[in-house]
């Protein structure tokens, strides 16, 4: 049977707004990723900032509703915004437990949704795990 959706929770220092209210934080201790059990959806999200071929996690958590993309089993980010010159925000939505912990690849910033060779790449069959 399904459990309530559980996602990785992270908010970079200085990030504006918080999604903490969209779930209940689990008491996971210090060495494990922080986890949040979603209150209003069965969907996780992740946001990464790609700057000069270096990806940094900005936010991870629960979405406020189930929307297109939430049916995805894995986190496949697409470019969403350019917060500053030379940097691109990538976001993903996905609908399995802790699916927002990692991404398999980032598409090139210039072509939304198209796989490409730019950006940090994982070897075939591997994933890039964000160090939280």
């Amino acid at each position: 049977p399904p459990n309530r959706r559980t996602c990785v929770f992270f908010e970079a220092p200085g990030v504006r707004g918080s999604t903490k209210t969209l779930g209940e934080l689990l008491d996971t201790g210090t060495e494990l990723p922080r986890a949040i059990r979603c209150l209003y959806s069965r969907c996780c999200f992740g946001i990464w900032n790609l700057t000069q071929d270096r990806a940094q996690v900005e936010m991870q958590g629960c979405r406020d509703s189930d929307e297109p993309g939430c049916e995805s089993l894995h986190c496949d980010p697409s470019p969403r915004a350019h917060p500053s010159p030379g940097s691109t925000l990538f976001t993903c939505s996905c609908g399995t437990d802790f699916c927002n912990a990692n991404y398999s690849h980032l598409p090139p910033p210039g072509s939304p949704g198209t796989p490409g060779s730019q950006g940090p790449q994982a070897a075939p069959g591997e994933s890039i795990w964000m160090a939280l």
Partner: antibody, heavy 113, light 112 residues
């Protein structure tokens, strides 16, 4: 097919600890929560807690915090539960379950001096 | 903690009869995501519990269609349309909407 094979019965002294195992097969171990459930003699069932094998995140019934520790060994697809400072109240059958759809056969723990 | 009250505590039936078990929750079991995490289990004598129904009304794989789950909010029912010998045992309702997850006290289904 999905199977959860639990370790054998245990007779332990009051104040001691016991660690039981639950070996999973027939599915991808890291993709499902493993839950643990207590059944005292002739009584109903109590949910102890659950662990997600991929990253070790666990979620507990407050009643069992400090009593139960949940761990996994991904290399052998095995989940473990350790119970400490045992008393007669801990005498029960303990089940592991794959997110509550498939269940192990149970481990009978008897606490007696 | 959420209390699940099962009635009756025991039920004596004749093979082929319909059986009905009620499970009433002290709080609504509809979660914020719209899903109701209410399940039914059968524990046969000397065996582990086995899942019958999840999400109020979804039969688990291999469960005969004579098992029917229904309800919403705080009131739930498990109906067995024609009781067969292998249906005898203790039935438990269970909720995974609120922490800690909790079970009902059980309903024993036995022969008259």
């Amino acid at each position: 097919q999905v199977k959860l094979l639990q370790s054998g019965a245990a007779l332990v002294k009051p104040g001691a600890s016991v660690k039981m195992s639950c070996k999973a097969s027939g599915y991808t171990f890291t993709d499902y929560w493993v839950s643990w459930v207590k059944q005292s003699h002739g009584k109903s069932l109590e949910w102890i807690g659950e662990i997600y094998p991929k990253n070790g995140v666990s979620n507990f019934n407050e009643k069992f915090k400090g009593k139960a520790t949940l761990t996994v060994d991904k290399s052998t697809s095995t989940a473990y539960m350790e119970l400490r400072r045992l008393t007669s109240e801990d005498s029960a059958i303990f089940y592991c379950t794959r997110q509550r759809d498939y269940w192990g056969q149970g481990v009978m723990v008897t606490v007696s001096s | 903690d959420v209390v699940l009250t099962q009635t009756p505590g025991s039920l004596s039936v004749t093979l082929g009869d319909q059986a009905s078990i009620s499970c009433r929750s002290s709080q609504s079991l509809e979660y914020g995501d719209g899903y109701t995490y209410l399940e039914w289990y059968l524990q046969k004598p000397g065996q582990s519990p086995q899942l019958l129904i999840y999400g109020v009304s979804n039969r688990f794989s291999g469960v005969p269609d004579r098992f029917i789950g229904s309800g919403s909010g705080t009131d739930f029912t498990l109906k067995i349309s024609r009781v067969e010998p292998e249906d005898l045992g203790v039935y438990y309702c269970f909720q995974a909407t609120h922490d800690p997850n909790t079970f009902g006290a059980g309903t024993k289904l036995e022969l008259k």
